[in-house]
């Protein structure tokens, strides 16, 4: 008889999760020569140790500390790109602008991007059937706590001018409940970060409104200013052109203002 399993509301661990994490780690070290010394088996062991045999609704940031300690990477000042609800464009941007980095361009973010995982209390098994859903089950689940932990660390280590890409098509352009709004904003260090520059990405071609005047952006400005960090905002009216100009800055259509 199949052993009884806890049934959660969310989808189960991504198929071949251990193999995927290990393969991604090896690929990352091959593409980033400065990480050539990293022993990916040790990284996987630390990752596994954070959630295996633990009740998946009682995971803490402390559980991920061994992994976070292993994955120490620093981003040069002025090169951190945060994002909220617009991951694809942020990643397209850093793929072109290779000297800027999102969390998913760093080892730990790269390992976990788009994956789901959880274990079961008192067994060494990974649960491929179901994992806790943030809303329906619990917020202290392995995936949510992982992203909270690494996002906090990513924000804490940022320096210089930090950029954030925000989705101008959302009803809340800045959402206090997003990872950016609830974790990253509050963990930028004023003694290291001079300014936060928000790039508000417009959705519609004919949308010429100044979304930097949106009430939620003003709210973000207020939060940031209270933390003694300067705030700037830019409208990106044409994201397609924006990317094209990052690729080809000499293009004549990119040279005007």
């Amino acid at each position: 008889l199949p052993r009884w399993r806890q049934q959660w509301s969310g989808s189960g661990t991504t198929s071949r999760f251990p193999e995927t994490v290990l393969a991604r780690c090896v690929k990352y070290t091959e593409v980033h020569p400065e990480m050539r010394h990293v022993d990916c088996q040790s990284v996987w062991d630390a990752f596994k140790g954070a959630f295996i045999s633990k009740y998946p609704c009682n995971i803490t940031e402390e559980d991920y500390q061994p992994l976070v300690k292993l994955g120490t990477q620093t981003v040069p000042c002025n090169k951190t790109l945060l994002w909220s609800r617009i991951k694809d464009l942020a990643h397209q941007f850093t793929q072109v602008q290779r000297d800027m980095f999102t969390l998913e361009d760093m080892l730990l973010g790269y390992l976990a991007d788009d994956l789901t995982w959880c274990g079961e209390f008192n067994t060494f098994e990974i649960n491929y059937q179901s994992c806790p859903d943030w809303r329906k089950d619990c917020s202290n689940n392995p995936v949510s706590v992982f992203w909270k932990t690494v996002s906090r660390r990513f924000a804490e280590t940022a320096c210089g001018v930090v950029h954030v890409m925000l989705n101008g098509s959302r009803s809340k352009i800045f959402d206090k409940n997003s990872t950016f709004g609830s974790v990253e904003v509050h963990n930028l260090q004023p003694e290291k970060v001079q300014a936060l520059e928000a790039w508000v990405i417009h959705g519609g071609r004919e949308d010429s409104r100044d979304l930097c005047q949106d009430p939620t952006i003003k709210e973000l400005e207020s939060i940031i200013s209270k933390r003694n960090i300067r705030f700037f905002c830019k409208n990106i009216y044409r994201p397609d052109k924006f990317l094209q100009c990052v690729k080809n800055p000499e293009d004549s259509s990119c040279l005007s203002g």
Epitope: E30, P33, E34, R36, H37, V38, D39, S42, V43, A46, P66, K69, L70, G71, T72
Partner: antibody, heavy 118, light 110 residues
Framework: QVQLVESGGGLVKPGGSLRLSCAAS????????MSWIRQAPGKGLEWVAS????????YYADSVRGRFTISRDNAKNSLYLQMNSLRAEDTAVYYC???????????WGRGTLVTVSS | QAGLTQPPSASGTSGQRVTISCSGS????????VYWYQHLPGTAPKLLIY???QRPSGVPDRFSGSKSGNSASLAISGLRSEDEADYYC???????????FGSGTKVTVL
């Protein structure tokens, strides 16, 4: 086969300067990270500095940071170590080494002796 | 610069097995690969083991490496007189952004 030949060692007074060179052959020099490692008399091996391939990034041991500069000339297949403000404790045999993909030092030169003494 | 910890000496009779330990921390051995080098006085050091347990071609299978947590070890089985040398472990240290070597272990064949 891979050959690494160090030169430039010798006797120098404390506070003085010296420039070590390493001539490389037998492999595509520009593709690999390169390093300097030293061994003081009667002591163990100590990593000194490394330089990456591509647009060079440099790494230094705390004991030499700010005094030593590692550099490379890919056109000449050469690695250099400029040593300034030398101290008695810098006395050692200095080895040039080639790093392979996993970070291991696969190939080493025979070393050049640097003596810092008044 | 704190290095890795090795015993200063190890010995065995010909044909015996000798193990050398190497102890580090989470910022070096814990996350990164371990390398082992053999050094005979007056010669260039030689790579014995890379990536914890891999042997370069030409290194006899009498030499084996392993790693667990923040420690590593080198085993020499079937000890021979030509194995008399100094052995060093090494690893990259993330907190120092540099390599750290062990203090070295002198192996003597009795």
């Amino acid at each position: 086969q891979v050959q690494l030949v160090e030169s430039g060692g010798g006797l120098v007074k404390p506070g003085g300067s010296l420039r070590l060179s390493c001539a490389a052959s037998g492999f595509t020099f520009s593709d690999d990270y390169m390093s300097w490692i030293r061994q003081a008399p009667g002591k163990g091996l100590e990593w000194v500095a490394s330089v990456s391939n591509g647009r060079p990034t440099t790494y230094y041991a705390d004991s030499v940071r700010g005094r030593f500069t590692i550099s490379r000339d890919n056109a000449k297949n050469s690695l250099y170590l400029q040593m300034n403000s030398l101290r008695a404790e810098d006395t050692a045999v200095y080895y040039c080494a080639r790093e392979d993909w996993g970070g291991e030092f696969t190939d080493w030169g025979r070393g050049t002796l640097v003596t810092v003494s008044s | 610069q704190a290095g890795l910890t090795q015993p200063p000496s190890a010995s065995g009779t010909s044909g015996q097995r000798v193990t050398i330990s190497c102890s580090g921390s989470s910022s070096n051995i814990g996350i990164n690969f371990v390398y082992w080098y053999q050094h005979l006085p007056g010669t260039a050091p030689k790579l014995l083991i890379y990536k914890n347990n891999q042997r370069p071609s030409g290194v006899p299978d009498r030499f084996s490496g392993s790693k667990s947590g923040n420690s590593a070890s080198l085993a020499i089985s079937g000890l021979r007189s030509e194995d008399e040398a100094d052995y060093y472990c090494a690893a990259w240290d993330d907190s120092l952004s540099g390599y750290v070597f062990g203090s070295g272990t002198k192996v003597t064949v009795l």
